[in-house]
C-alpha cells in the first residue's frame, strides 16, 4: 500500500538545522544517561539509522528512530527526550506505520536499553549530519 505525504518536504538546509539540533540534544541525553554507573551497552538492541537505498535528506529512518525514543520516554522522563521527539516529528514527511518496540521488563535491562539506544542515537545523528553535508557538497560540485 502506498503512503500519502502528510507535509511538504523541507529544504535540505532546514533538515540540516534540525539534524544539527538533534545531534546536540543526543549528546546531552547520552551524557546524562552515562551518569548511571554499572550499566553496560547491550548487543540486543539496534537502532535503525540511515537507509542505504535513499538519498539525503530522505535517508534518515526518522519514524523508527522516533519510535525508539518514545519507548525510552516510557522509562525515563527527562525533558530532553520530549524535545528530541518534537524535532524527529519534523523529519517525518510521510505517514509511516508505527514501529513496534517491546519494552524490557527487568529494571537493569531497561537501563541497558536506554544506554544502548542513546549511544546509537548519538552516533546516528553524527552519521546523518555527515551524509547531509557530503550530499550538499556533491550537489554543488
Amino acid at each position: 500500500s502506498h503512503t500519502l505525504p502528510v507535509r511538504l518536504l523541507r529544504p535540505s538546509d532546514d533538515v540540516q538545522k534540525i539534524v544539527e539540533e538533534l545531534q546536540s540534544l543526543s549528546k546531552m541525553l547520552l551524557k546524562d544517561v552515562e551518569e548511571e554507573k554499572g550499566v553496560l551497552v547491550s548487543q540486543n538492541y539496534t537502532l535503525p539509522c540511515l537507509s542505504p537505498d535513499a538519498q539525503p535528506p530522505n535517508n534518515i529512518h526518522s519514524p523508527a528512530i522516533r519510535a525508539y525514543l518514545k519507548t525510552i520516554r516510557q522509562l525515563d522522563n527527562k525533558s530532553v527526550i520530549d524535545e528530541i521527539i518534537e524535532h524527529l516529528d519534523k523529519l517525518i514527511f510521510q505517514d509511516a506505520p508505527e514501529t513496534n518496540i517491546s519494552v524490557p521488563t527487568d529494571t537493569h535491562e531497561c537501563k541497558r536499553f536506554i544506554l544502548t539506544i542513546s549511544q546509537q542515537f548519538s552516533e546516528c545523528m553524527d552519521l546523518a549530519l555527515k551524509s547531509l553535508t557530503s550530499g550538499a557538497q556533491q550537489a554543488t560540485t
Partner: antibody, heavy 124, light 110 residues
Amino acid sequence: QSQLVESGGGLVQPGGSLRLSCAASGFSFSANYWICWVRQAPGKGLEWIVCISIGSRADTYYAPWAKGRFTISKDNSKNTVYLQMNSLRAEDTAVYFCARFSSGIYDLDRFFLWGQGTLVTVSS
Amino acid sequence: FQLTQSPSSLSASVGDRVTITCQASQSIDSWLAWYQQKPGKPPKLLIYQASKLASGVPSRFSGSGSGTDYTLTISSLQPEDFATYYCQTYYGGGHIGWGFGTGTKVTVLG
C-alpha cells in the same frame, strides 16, 4: 544517609522577599532526577511550586501561579537548590518542602526523598 | 493540567478495604506516585510508577491504573493507616508538568 535540608524560612512582611535553600547531603547531584519545591499551607493539601532538572540542561517547570514571583536555581558545586520568593502575600504562609524525584527508572524509589520543611510566615 | 482525587474524605474501620482514585486531565504514562502524610511530617512514598511498591511499605498497599485513571487500594486497613493520602504526577516532559491531587483524609468510623 541521603537527606535534604531546607533553610531560610521565617517571618516576612507582605511584599517582602525571602530566599530558601535546599542542601543535599549524603549524595551528589546527578542527571537522573529532579529537585522540586512543594508547599503546604496550614491545614491544607500539598501544592507543587517548581522543579529543576539536575543534568546537562537545567530545565525548569513552574506551576502557572508561581511564574514571575518565584524563581528556582541551583549551585552544583554546593549541592544546593534555591527558591527565591518575591512580593510575598499572606496566602504564601506555608511549610515549604524541598523534594527529590526520580527521572524515570533510575534508582527506583530511593530517588524519592523529602526534606522536613521550613516554615514561611507572611504577616505584618 | 489537573489531578482530581476522590473521595476528599472517608471514614472506615480497621480491616476495611479502602479505595482512593486519582484522575489526570490527560495521560501521564504511569508517572504517578501515592503518598501517605501524617500531621507535622513530610509525605511518605507508598507507590511509584503507578503500581510499584516502595521499599519498606506493607503489601496491603497497592496501586493500579494507566493513562488517566489510577487507584490506590489498602486491602485491610490498619490503625496506623489513618492519615491523608495524595496522588502526584512527576512527569518531567514539557507537556504535562507536575502536580498533586487534592488529598483524601482517612478517619476512624464512629
